[in-house]
């Protein structure tokens, strides 16, 4: 079944969902509760939570994997990832967006066989929505001391976005406040008529400028943020590209 609420339901009806292993009764996977799987097409409003279930049994206890549109479904394939609750044979996606639309297949396998079941998810867009940031931006960058660098944050928002560029900083020699959250400094922010707020330009950089830069975008509905790292190299070293890392801003200075 699929739910579309903001809270993950506790599965209290799972008496048949998890079948204990018995060596003398080996068998291929089988569905234990087909009623929960009858509804294949799910149209869910954006921002809601979706749960797909494939309650199964077998001996030995089968493993479960999920495919999206016939391909392995990885955590990095969606913002916020997803949860798999193996004991409840469920896939949970919170705050669904249009890009989550598609076919979701549970693949249940053990050494004696394999079964699968496919759900189709349609996300009904409720506009306006919180900002969406283009994947991969801002991109990690490196430059030599004295060089210039530009970070770009591409924003899609159908309500007026407020853009902030934020950097982790130290205060009294500490990177973290008394509450354990990092100190953050707003380097640039947009006003209603601000132009080019999507670009943060740094000139004549020093080693002090190295670190994580966060593009944080808010509209009246919600927020989104992505980050990139700046590596500052000694003048004799050539720039290198680094793998992107994301983080969430917590503590504004």
């Amino acid at each position: 079944d699929a739910i579309s609420s903001g809270d993950d339901e506790d599965d209290t009806d799972s008496s048949e969902d998890f079948v204990s292993e018995n060596r003398s009764n080996q068998r291929a996977p089988y569905w234990t509760n087909t009623e929960k799987m009858e509804k294949r097409l799910h149209a869910v409003p954006a921002a809601n939570t979706v749960k797909f279930r494939c309650p199964a049994g077998g001996n030995p206890t089968p493993t479960m994997r999920w495919l999206k549109n016939g391909k392995e479904f990885k955590q990095e394939h969606r913002i916020g990832g997803y949860k798999v609750r193996n004991q409840h044979w469920s896939l949970i996606m919170e705050s669904v967006v249009p890009s989550d639309k598609g076919n979701y297949t549970c693949l249940v396998e053990n050494e004696y066989g394999s079964i699968n079941h496919t759900y189709h998810l349609d996300v009904v867009e409720r506009s306006p929505h919180r900002p969406i940031l283009q994947a991969g931006l801002p991109a990690n960058a490196s430059t030599v001391v004295g060089g210039d660098v530009e970070f770009v944050c591409k924003v899609y928002s159908d309500a007026q976005p407020h853009i902030q560029w934020i950097k982790h900083v130290e205060k009294n020699g500490s990177k973290y406040g008394p509450d354990g959250l990092p100190y953050l400094k707003v380097l640039k922010h947009s006003g209603i008529n601000s132009s080019n707020a999507e670009v943060l330009a740094l000139f004549n950089v020093t080693e002090m400028d190295a670190g994580e830069y966060i593009c944080k975008v808010s509209n009246y509905i919600g927020q989104a943020n992505q980050s990139a790292w700046l590596t500052v190299l000694p003048k004799q070293q050539a720039p290198v590209r680094e793998k992107e890392i994301t983080a969430s801003p917590d503590y504004l200075e």
Epitope: G6, A47, N48, E94, A159, Q160, N193, N219, Y220, G222
Partner: antibody
Framework: EVQLHQSGTVLARPGASVKMSCKTS????????MHWIKQRPGQGLEWIGA????????NYNQKFKGKAKLTAVTSASTAYMDLSSLTNEDSAVYYC??????WGQGTTLTVSS | QIVLTQSPAIMSASPGEKVTMTCSAS?????MSWYQQKPGSSPRLLIY???NLASGVPVRFSGSGSGTSYSLTISRMEAEDAATYYC?????????FGGGTKLEIK
């Protein structure tokens, strides 16, 4: 179904403080700003401020800084507003709203000695 | 802050009549929202992003405008449309509402 359920009518003395709640269900509470709106009897609507439950970010209308304090408990999907140093001017209906299209039923506050 | 001025403050219309009310902003805006409120009820979103109809709102309601001038139109007035209508801007802090237009049925 999305629901925002606000706490009931409050009667308070001048100078006192009150706390009202807005319990939500049916959507991902942490992902959306929760706005608070004031409406005095027979008057228009005023934006007090908003809280983003995911990280605790808060924006206040300058007019209500020091008067209103916004908080949220994500585990309970509930937003709160404290109003302090109450005067007759604070007598109003207070609404919580998320996304602009989801509204609570309002909490009526009457300040009277 | 951006001041929104609605006009007229009060108006009346007969069933079937076309109704237009306006909202003027003290500074240019990207978008405008419109709400309907009936006595004893919470505001109800009618129009977002200037011209988009909110879920469940009858198609007789429409919104238009840009910059500093916006309007809400009801193509054919119905008795249930008697209410107070507010414009609101979500573009600039502090977010602000207009003073409202009270629409009565003749």
């Amino acid at each position: 179904e999305v629901q925002l359920h606000q706490s009931g009518t409050v009667l308070a003395r001048p100078g006192a403080s009150v706390k009202m709640s807005c319990k939500t269900s049916g959507y991902t509470f942490t992902n959306y700003w929760m706005h608070w709106i004031k409406q005095r009897p027979g008057q228009g609507l005023e934006w007090i401020g908003a809280i983003y439950p995911e990280n605790g970010d808060i924006n206040y209308n300058q007019k209500f800084k020091g008067k209103a304090k916004l908080t949220a408990v994500t585990s309970a999907s509930t937003a709160y507003m404290d109003l302090s140093s109450l005067t007759n001017e604070d007598s109003a209906v207070y609404y919580c709203t998320s996304r602009g299209d989801y509204w609570g039923q309002g909490t009526t506050l009457t300040v009277s000695s | 802050q951006i001041v929104l001025t609605q006009s007229p403050a009060i108006m009346s219309a007969s069933p079937g009549e076309k109704v237009t009310m306006t909202c003027s902003a003290s500074s240019g805006l990207s978008y405008m929202s419109w709400y309907q409120q009936k006595p004893g009820s919470s505001p109800r979103l009618l129009i977002y992003d200037t011209s988009n109809l909110a879920s469940g709102v009858p198609v007789r309601f429409s919104g238009s405008g840009s910059g500093t001038s916006y309007s809400l139109t009801i193509s054919r007035m119905e008795a249930e449309d008697a209410a107070t209508y507010y414009c609101q801007q979500w573009s600039s802090y502090p977010y602000t509402f207009g003073g409202g237009t009270k629409l009565e049925i003749k």
